[in-house]
């Protein structure tokens, strides 16, 4: 009787105290059987006393759906537990992943303080270099200024023949005969002259191309620039120069930036030659034109503006054209072949 | 290609005459064109020349101011002569001188037949 | 002035022979030298242009040489037919009417 129960009741107990909390008990079905055991001991000894059968059933019917309730919850607890399992690790990735991440943004802000360095650094250099390139700048404009002086010193001595056909078989002797027969055809003084002194002739450019519309120019260096000089002359007198009836221009052979200088002079050239002031393009690229009865220079626009600004009549006239830019459509100089 | 002198004639002293030499299957423009004249027994001598496409001209320098060359039309070149004397007498040929610069180098490479003018009273 | 000097003024050959006549420009005037034949009665006859080179229908036996000042014309194996008067042009200087032609050498052939 008692003793046994008590018995039992400590053991049980026991069992109790040294099985886990409920819940992790739960999960072991040895142990469920032995609870149960134990409860039919009870009712074997005691139960059938206290109540009928029916009470018992119902009891293990309650018992049955708290077991597979517990069941349900246990199933529930693992798969939250699961998951939990797996958020942990995702979230032990995501902690390395921004233990990486840091270290990459200690890497790159460190990398950014050198580079900011540099590009300090740099800037520094670039104003040192920007400092150097004007005065570069400078030096190269100068530089470029004596080259082409050079170049039209170096060109002055000759003559271009623009428009002179070309024919199959070309060398310096029949190129020489051409000269020759230009001469002759269109410069009767010159003509009778002594022997016009050659000490080069050629084709520019020297390669020949059939594909080319336009014959190429003749390039004639004369042993003394006087002799360029008459004839430009002369051709500016005549007006019209032809090769066997054909015409063709003369013109001196300058640099390309002397060129482009002449040609910026051609709206006002023309202008002052319709309002007949006898402008002329004089070597390299002077303006002259009679005003007031004397023949005045202009190495510039600028010099020819500040000229004009007390003559107003000549100011209205050229105030277009001296206000054009730089890179303007500049329109050919009439008969500059004649300058 | 051809060339025919006319206007030879037999003229007394001081008097003009006018030489015409028509060119035909060539154009004038490419040529200089001359006139010749040969006296009897003597040797070729040039008067004067013209380039037709520039009309400039050139004179032997007893030919100045007596005779005068010119291009009168795309086909014929005259030769006024004034003030003609017995030693004008000659044969006049009208001849084409090529360029200089052309192949054949400034020769004559095309003659007319020539006209004959007689100067006597 | 370019005066051209033509010598000899007269020459006689047998035929069969070599005939050379000279002519002399006193400037250069580069291969800018033509030759002519001319017989009594006739216009003159271009046989050399540009100093050497044969001009179409003129014999073989004909031939120019020389640049600059001096030239020459031979006639190589003389024949009766080539008895005339031969003559060098300056073909530089048009402006120099006076010194066109060289005062010509009579070829006569025994």
């Known amino acids: 009787g008692m003793g046994k129960k008590q018995n039992r009741k400590t053991g049980n107990s026991k069992t109790q105290s040294a099985s886990p909390p409920p819940k992790e008990r739960s999960s072991s079905p040895a142990t469920e059987q032995s609870w149960m055991e134990n409860d039919f001991d009870e009712l074997r000894e005691e139960g059938f006393r206290r109540s009928n059968y029916s009470e018992l059933r119902e009891d293990i019917q309650t018992k049955g759906k708290e077991v597979e309730n517990f069941e349900k919850n246990l199933e529930e607890c693992i798969t939250r537990i699961t998951n939990t399992e797996k958020c942990l690790k995702e979230l032990m990735e995501l902690k390395t992943k921004a233990r990486e991440l840091r270290e990459e943004c200690r890497s790159l802000r460190s990398r950014c303080d050198q580079l900011e360095e540099r590009v300090s650094a740099m800037e520094d250099e670039m104003n040192e270099m920007k400092r150097e390139g004007k005065f570069r700048e400078k030096r190269i404009k100068r530089n470029e200024q004596s080259l082409q002086e050079i170049w039209d010193y170096v060109k002055r001595p000759n003559l271009r023949l623009i428009g002179v056909p070309e024919s199959d078989v070309e060398n310096g002797t029949k190129l020489e005969n051409t000269l020759q027969d230009i001469i002759q055809e269109n410069f009767p003084n010159l003509a009778r002259q002594a022997n016009v002194q050659i000490q080069e002739i050629q084709r520019t450019p020297q390669r020949y191309s059939s594909r080319r519309a336009t014959p190429r120019h003749i390039i004639v260096r004369f042993t003394k620039v006087e002799m360029k000089e008459k004839m430009l002359r002369a051709a500016r007198e005549k007006g019209r120069v032809t090769l066997k009836g054909k015409p063709i221009r003369l013109t001196a052979d300058l640099s390309a930036e002397t060129l482009q200088a002449r040609r910026e002079w051609g709206p006002i050239f023309n202008i002052l030659k319709e309002k007949n002031f006898q402008p002329r393009i004089s070597y390299p690229a002077k303006l002259s034109f009679i005003s007031e009865g004397e023949i005045k220079y202009f190495i510039d626009k600028q010099m020819l503006r500040d000229f004009v600004t007390t003559r107003p009549a000549l100011k209205e006239l050229l105030k277009e054209a001296l206000n054009m830019e730089r890179n303007n459509r500049y329109q050919p100089l009439q008969n500059h072949a004649k300058m | 290609q051809s060339l025919e002198e006319s206007g030879g004639d037999l003229v007394k002293p001081g008097a003009s005459l006018t030489l015409t030499c028509t060119a035909s299957?060539?154009?004038?423009?490419?040529?200089?064109m001359y006139w010749v004249r040969q006296a009897p027994g003597k040797g070729l001598e040039s008067i004067a020349c013209?380039?037709?496409?520039?009309?400039?001209t050139y004179y032997a320098t007893w030919a100045k101011g007596r005779f005068t060359i010119s291009k009168t039309s795309s086909t014929t070149v005259t030769l006024q002569m004034t003030s003609l004397t017995a030693a004008d007498t000659a044969t006049y040929f009208c001849?084409?001188?090529?360029?200089?610069?052309?192949?054949?180098?400034?020769?004559?490479?095309?003659w007319g037949p020539g006209t004959l003018v007689t100067v006597s009273s | 002035a370019y005066d051209m000097t033509q010598t000899p003024a007269s020459v006689s050959e047998p035929v069969g022979g070599t005939v050379t006549i000279k002519c002399q420009a006193s400037?250069?005037?580069?291969?800018?030298l033509a030759w002519y034949q001319q017989k009594p009665g006739q216009r003159p006859k271009l046989l050399i242009y540009?100093?050497?080179y044969l001009a179409s229908g003129a014999p073989s036996r004909f031939k120019g040489s020389g640049s600059g000042t001096e030239f020459t014309l031979t006639i190589s194996g003389v024949q009766c037919d080539d008895a005339a008067t031969y003559y060098c042009?300056?073909?530089?200087?048009?402006?120099?009417?006076?010194?066109?032609f060289g005062g010509g050498t009579e070829v006569v052939v025994k």
């Open positions: 001849a084409r001188r090529t360029y200089t610069s052309d192949s054949y180098a400034g020769s004559f490479n095309l």
């Open positions: 299957g060539f154009s004038l423009n490419n040529y200089v």
């Open positions: 013209i380039y037709t496409g520039s009309g400039t």
């Open positions: 400037q250069s005037i580069g291969s800018n």
């Open positions: 540009a100093a050497s």
């Open positions: 042009q300056q073909g530089w200087s048009s402006s120099d009417v006076d010194s066109t």
